[in-house]
């Protein structure tokens, strides 16, 4: 039944049917108003001294504009024992980066160093298995750098960049621990999150994802902000660098799923994911020809004798996809976010190890510059053919 | 529809050779490892080999390893099993499996085929 | 190769028993552990993967628990079509081994 004529949205909201939302109905919210039922607004919040509320599109926000004005802040010097502090724009309006055996929210906590010296991969079935393109769960372990590399997306060592006292791989334990809760120590898997939920109306919203509408009900970071839909009048706070994963999907496929492809990453990354378009607006969506034609490439550039039948049966395995995040949305819900892709890499690498992937990803890499010949990809100014195969294989 | 579907099993001499070919449909070929299991006749079931069509990389059991070996070809989605040298104890029906983790061994086996026998017998 | 044996090698049963099989690793295979289902003249069908997650499409009679070295799986109220042999199998580490198997037949 239509339930629109009960007018179920407040405060001016405009009442649309869906038939797939379990309420049978959608609210489309005037500015200043959120909610299911567009019945949040700043009026029922209230914020401390310092800070001002302001709505977004998440609903209503308590940020302090100016950290020095907040209570809580630094200025109560609540990091001890050395610790560092940094002040934050949303409650608690700091954070404290830990010196060595100290860690907690304000580096209450000793940890005493731990002795034990670096575990090493010994077993002769590992060194064997080892970067032979199979995740081998015998030796998933950080000792042997994850099967070679073989379950983390071809990446060693996620952690490599991760300096807290704690191993935080081997925190990954569904409970927070504070000092694996930076970018470097990818966010304690985020484990830290107080409000960690799942969408609610989960089937709709990946229908609805990255639609150009704005569907309030998705407008979470659960939801992955409804694929910045509701954010379309807010400026991109781009990451620095591009994320390069080869998929096993073909271009066409990949294209076709990519909204929920793009939405499976964001959920993982807790921010949101776009396909980087080259200089003449093309999507850098290019064919993986996998690493045995790599080899076949290399045998081409030494000989030049390669029969042209030959190189055109090579099969599109996958492809290979530039991506950029933009943390507009991350970035006013949130402390987690990515400053730049290499973090946001490790991320995925390490939902690989932990087997949470969704998708047949095959390597991921992190290029904090322009990616090589990327500015070209695509725009019909290719010497020859090798030059265009570089873009594949680079 | 997840489909494999096993052919080339028969009669063949010991010392003989036979290739058994699994043909797969409905899902990306590539992004699954696969492995052949068998059955000797009332008796249970033993892994033989596994392949990651995407990376080409194998594994055998002890049992078969330099008279079996196993290959994929993308472009068919197929895999295959080569058995050269073959002995009386490889009599067994043959089943092809698919792995439900991408590129982890370290998964189920979801989708098997029917199965093809061979039998080795003078 | 790790060694799995599983118990009873043959069971006899009613319709609406409770039944139980048990799997031993002989070593820790963490939860890397499936159940399979197989009827004469059958493919085998995968039942219980990492220990305790039941496949798409088992009925929920069918529940498997354990980790390490020991598994259980257990089919809460025996229907006809349970009737059949259920292998265990490790994959945590190649060569992937079953176990012998378990028939369940009709009392």
């Known amino acids: 039944a239509d339930v629109c004529p009960q007018k179920p949205c407040l405060n001016g909201g405009t009442c649309a049917v869906a038939s797939n939302m379990p309420d049978g109905f959608i609210c489309r919210c005037p500015p200043g108003f959120s909610g299911a039922r567009c019945q949040s607004s700043c009026g029922q919040v209230k914020c401390r001294r310092g800070e001002q509320c302001i709505h977004t599109d998440s609903g209503p926000r308590c940020f302090c504009l100016n950290p020095k004005d907040c209570e809580s802040g630094c200025a109560s010097n609540p990091c001890q024992h050395g610790g560092t502090c940094y002040p934050q724009r949303q409650p608690p309006h700091y954070s404290c980066r830990c010196p060595p055996s100290f860690g907690g929210s304000h580096c209450e906590l000793y940890t005493a160093p731990t002795s034990t010296p670096p575990a090493t991969c010994q077993s002769q079935y590992c060194a064997d298995k080892a970067r032979d393109g199979i995740c081998d769960e015998a030796c998933n372990s950080h000792a042997c750098q994850w099967d070679g590399g073989d379950c983390s997306l071809t990446m060693e060592d996620p952690w490599a960049n991760c300096t807290s006292t704690l191993r935080c791989w081997e925190y990954i334990n569904n409970q927070c621990d504070e000092q694996c809760n930076t970018a470097e120590c990818l966010f304690d898997n985020f484990e830290c999150q107080r409000n960690s939920k799942t969408c609610k109306y989960d089937k709709y919203c990946a229908d609805h994802f990255k639609d150009n509408h704005c569907d309030q009900g998705c407008n979470s970071e659960e939801c992955g902000w409804d694929g910045l839909d509701c954010a379309s009048d807010q400026p991109e706070n781009l990451a620095e660098g591009t994320l390069i994963i080869v998929v096993l999907l073909p271009p066409e496929q990949l294209l076709q799923d990519s909204r929920s492809f793009l939405r499976a990453l964001g959920t993982l990354l807790h921010t949101n994911l776009r396909i980087k378009q080259d200089s003449q607006g093309a999507l850098m969506v290019y064919p993986y020809f996998g690493e045995k034609s790599a080899a076949m490439k290399k045998q081409k550039m030494t000989r030049r004798s390669l029969p042209e039948e030959q190189e055109q049966e090579q099969e599109v395995i996958g492809s290979k996809i530039f991506l950029e995040i933009d943390n507009r949305q991350c970035v006013q819900d949130s402390d987690q976010c990515f400053k730049n892709t290499d973090a946001a890499a490790a991320l995925l690498a390490s939902h690989a190890i932990q087997g949470t992937l969704s998708y047949p990803l095959v390597s991921v890499f992190s290029e904090l510059e322009s990616p090589r010949n990327a500015r070209r990809a695509g725009s019909g100014d290719y010497k020859d053919d090798d030059d265009k195969e570089n873009l594949y294989f680079q | 529809e997840v489909q494999l579907v096993e052919s080339g099993g028969g009669l063949v001499q010991p010392g003989g050779s036979l290739r058994l070919s699994c043909a797969a449909s409905?899902?990306?070929?590539?992004?699954?490892?696969m492995s052949w299991v068998r059955q000797a006749p009332g008796k249970g079931l033993e892994w033989v080999s596994y392949i990651y069509p995407y990376s080409g990389a194998t594994y055998y059991a002890d049992s078969v390893k330099g008279r079996f070996t196993i290959s994929a070809d993308t472009s068919k989605n197929t895999a295959y099993l080569q058995m050269n040298s073959l002995r009386a104890e490889d009599t067994a029906v043959y089943y092809c499996?698919?792995?439900?983790?991408?590129?982890?061994?370290?998964?189920?086996?979801?989708?098997w085929g029917q199965g093809t026998l061979v039998t080795v017998s003078a | 190769d790790i060694q799995m044996t599983q118990s009873p090698s043959s069971l006899s049963a009613s319709v609406g028993d409770r039944v139980t099989i048990t799997c031993r690793a002989s070593q820790n295979i963490k939860r890397f552990l499936a159940w399979y289902q197989q009827k004469p003249g059958k493919a085998p069908k995968l039942l219980i993967y990492?220990?305790?997650t039941r496949e798409s499409g088992v009925p929920s009679r069918f529940s498997g628990s354990g980790s390490g070295t020991d598994f259980t799986l257990t089919i809460s109220s025996l229907q006809p079509e349970d009737f059949a042999t259920y292998y265990c199998q490790q994959y945590y580490r190649s060569p992937h081994t079953f176990g012998q198997g378990t028939k369940v037949e009709i009392k």
């Open positions: 409905g899902y990306t070929f590539s992004s699954y490892g």
């Open positions: 990492g220990a305790s």
């Open positions: 499996a698919r792995h439900s983790g991408y590129y982890r061994i370290s998964s189920a086996m979801d989708v």
